[in-house]
Amino acid sequence: EPCVEVVPNITYQCMELNFYKIPDNLPFSTKNLDLSFNPLRHLGSYSFFSFPELQVLDLSRCEIQTIEDGAYQSLSHLSTLILTGNPIQSLALGAFSGLSSLQKLVAVETNLASLENFPIGHLKTLKELNVAHNLIQSFKLPEYFSNLTNLEHLDLSSNKIQSIYCTDLRVLHQMPLLNLSLDLSLNPMNFIQPGAFKEIRLHKLTLRNNFDSLNVMKTCIQGLAGLEVHRLVLGEFRNEGNLEKFDKSALEGLCNLTIEEFRLAYLDYYLDDIIDLFNCLTNVSSFSLVSVTIERVKDFSYNFGWQHLELVNCKFGQFPTLKLKSLKRLTFTSNKGGNAFSEVDLPSLEFLDLSRNGLSFKGCCSQSDFGTTSLKYLDLSFNGVITMSSNFLGLEQLEHLDFQHSNLKQMSEFSVFLSLRNLIYLDISHTHTRVAFNGIFNGLSSLEVLKMAGNSFQENFLPDIFTELRNLTFLDLSQCQLEQLSPTAFNSLSSLQVLNMSHNNFFSLDTFPYKCLNSLQVLDYSLNHIMTSKKQELQHFPSSLAFLNLTQNDFACTCEHQSFLQWIKDQRQLLVEVERMECATPSDKQGMPVLSLNITCQMNK
Amino acid sequence: QKQYWVCNSSDASISYTYCDKMQYPISINVNPCIELKRSKGLLHIFYIPRRDLKQLYFNLYITVNTMNLPKRKEVICRGSDDDYSFCRALKGETVNTTISFSFKGIKFSKGKYKCVVEAISGSPEEMLFCLEFVILHQPNSN
């Protein structure tokens, strides 16, 4: 069976084809080659000499037991080599020779027992080394690591490392890899010698499910003393053994580390006294809790120095009353618990993501809700009922506002967005908004993107609601049950580039409303019920138009619509997916491509 | 279409068939077997994925006695610092994991429940596997 040609001469997918040897019928120019799940078993010298341009080679699960000297010798351009799931028993000292450009080496689940005799010391370009899910017992980084000056990621997770000694990291003292991210998760650790990490600098250290008791965790964290780490990730996994006890003493040792960003990722334990628990983390710049259960989050001190707080997929007793002086970014998403938003006091806040929490807002939106006048980004999407009762007083700096898939109330009672002269992006898609007030978008003089799909309009008519949106470049009015539009609805939108009118209920097409759209490039009228033109004589669309989508409409391929069908043919160079433009009537022409019809008035005879 | 039996409990019988053409082997054990009136137990999965499990989610299509419920999307792996350790599993890496589950107080009517589980993962998104579970429920059986 032949390989699948994904990109001609470049990418070939030969997965699970029962190949016993490397195929020799692929182009020399091949850059990406997937040979995974083939029983190759043995790689001899120059196994890949036919592919000198190769950049990515996937040999996952190829039952490889032996890799000989120079197996990859010809692959000087190879940047990624994947060996996952091969039961390697014999790895020659020169197995990886010739890989002068290799940046990523994945040797996950390859029976690797030690880093010491892994022959990669010459791979100077290596950026990522993944040796997870192996049999490595010692964390001693061999001397050859001093050659790997570009190494950024070292994944040693799911190995058998139990202890870390001062001598294990000696090589990092000789040449500090300032950007190294190290994952030691799922190693059964019980001892870290104090001083082992002293004066070591890491970009990221991940320790999840490493400790089988609170005491072990405490002593191991104390063993990290002196470490300077940009991002520290601690925690557990839901499907692994979890700590039976967790209290404020667990993280005391973190006071002896220098941490820029901290994340606690999944904890099968109910946290209550969080102010004491995170006592050593009051001055990290970014603090993150993922999948953690917390009863009270009103105990964070106003003085905590966090600039970014992230609470994701957590469970709360009630919405947290957050009062934090320095906070600039708050990400609070996909959480459960407190269903009603309550005021926060975040005077420095610029970025706020409150999406996907099922929250209801008794009132929205004012500076008093968030305690800031600096807010630039606000995402309230995928929440519950949001009652619009203030027009963003004090929030005039907003540039990005997203309400999609929340239920907006009182949208047509006043000019909700009147204060938002700096707003660039607004998404009110699928918000149950019924437009019954022409001033709905008053004030949005800087708006560039407006998404309002899945809403409705009074009498299914689009009125002149965009008159102030002179900078608009993108407008989505799809799924709005529209049947008609004002001939002047788009007259002020001279910058508009993309207009989506798909999935509405238009029965005819008219070019007149688009005459002022001098910048229009994309017009989507797919999934309507267009049968014909509104007027007999259709004018041209703006000359800027490059893509016109009329697919999945109800074209009437009858004599009386001959001029419309001819007009469509004349627009051929603009039309996209023409094969999906089919006749709906008459029944004998149903399903026929509109453009393949011979339009003569013999059609209906 | 070959049917794979999972287990029987006091009120349910569970089996599955593949609904994709690949039919890559997957081993599923439930201990103790699910009782629909209330249940607590361990789901054990042994599987060698044909693509990375990063950003894994399930599309669930549930049918209750021929009535179709709306499609549900269950995100399992968000892509970083995920809840489950298998979210970091790579294509070709053995996934051998045990997941605890519990639910209670759901009253199911007697009948045939079908659940099509479409597992989607990776970037670009592609189907990992598709299984159709059939649960025969007899509330009063011993």
Epitope: D299, Y302, K362, G394 | -
Partner: antibody
């Protein structure tokens, strides 16, 4: 500059309903914040009574819940307090105030004394 | 509800002297505590929020400290115009509550 001004009768009979109004200038009561009533019996401390949010939502001190109503007139930019079935212990200086998100009160009216007496 | 206990109830102090007023909460309220000054026949005036953050325009001799359950308001060098009653307020949870007050008198 936000200013608050209480007004209403200074004398109310026992069992009657006490009614006060707070006129706000310098800020719209529908524009943001929550608007509160706080009272202070002569020679005693301060007691928080309840509030009306800019959205119209109200909440009260549990000790007064059965007797208190707070409403607003947005056209006049004012909010009102009604306290039913008053007794002598309701004699106090009544303040209206605006709360900020810290849950502190930076803006207060000057207060109005209401005496409950027959 | 959170009960705030102020002490002392009354303090008579000579000018330029240091005044210390304490406020104890019945449960931990982090640093969500505010201080007010009320002069006779006037409405209260916010002095300090979040235990230690002075409000702009408030003289620098006023300072606050504390966290959890124990809080202190300090007037470093008392002046005649500081004669007033001082109240602490719980800003942690509803119902909002005030301390009983501390009356500071000039000797």
């Amino acid at each position: 500059q936000v200013q608050l001004q209480e007004s209403g009768p200074g004398l109310v009979k026992p069992s009657d309903t006490l009614s006060l109004t707070c006129a706000v200038s310098g800020y719209s009561i529908t524009g943001g914040y929550s608007w509160h009533w706080i009272r202070q019996p002569p020679g005693k401390g301060l007691e928080w009574m309840g509030y009306i949010h800019y959205s119209g939502y109200t909440d009260f001190n549990p000790s007064l819940k059965t007797r208190i109503t707070i409403s607003r007139d947005t056209s006049k930019n004012q909010f009102s307090l009604k306290l039913s079935s008053v007794t002598a212990v309701d004699t106090a200086v009544y303040y209206c105030a605006r709360k900020d998100p810290s849950d502190a009160f930076p803006y207060w009216g000057q207060g109005t004394l209401v005496t409950v007496s027959s | 509800e959170i009960v705030l206990t102020q002490s002392p109830d009354f303090q008579s102090v000579t000018p330029k002297e240091k005044v210390t007023i304490t406020c104890r909460a019945s449960q931990s309220i982090s640093d969500h505590l505010h201080w007010y000054q009320q002069k006779p026949d006037q409405s209260p005036k916010l002095l300090i929020k979040y235990a230690s953050h002075a409000i702009s325009g408030v003289p620098s001799r006023f300072s606050g400290s504390g966290s959890g359950t124990d809080f202190t308001l300090t007037i470093n060098s008392l002046e005649a115009e500081d004669a007033a009653t001082y109240y602490c307020q719980n800003g942690h949870s509803f119902p909002l509550t005030f301390g009983g007050g501390t009356k500071v008198e000039i000797k």
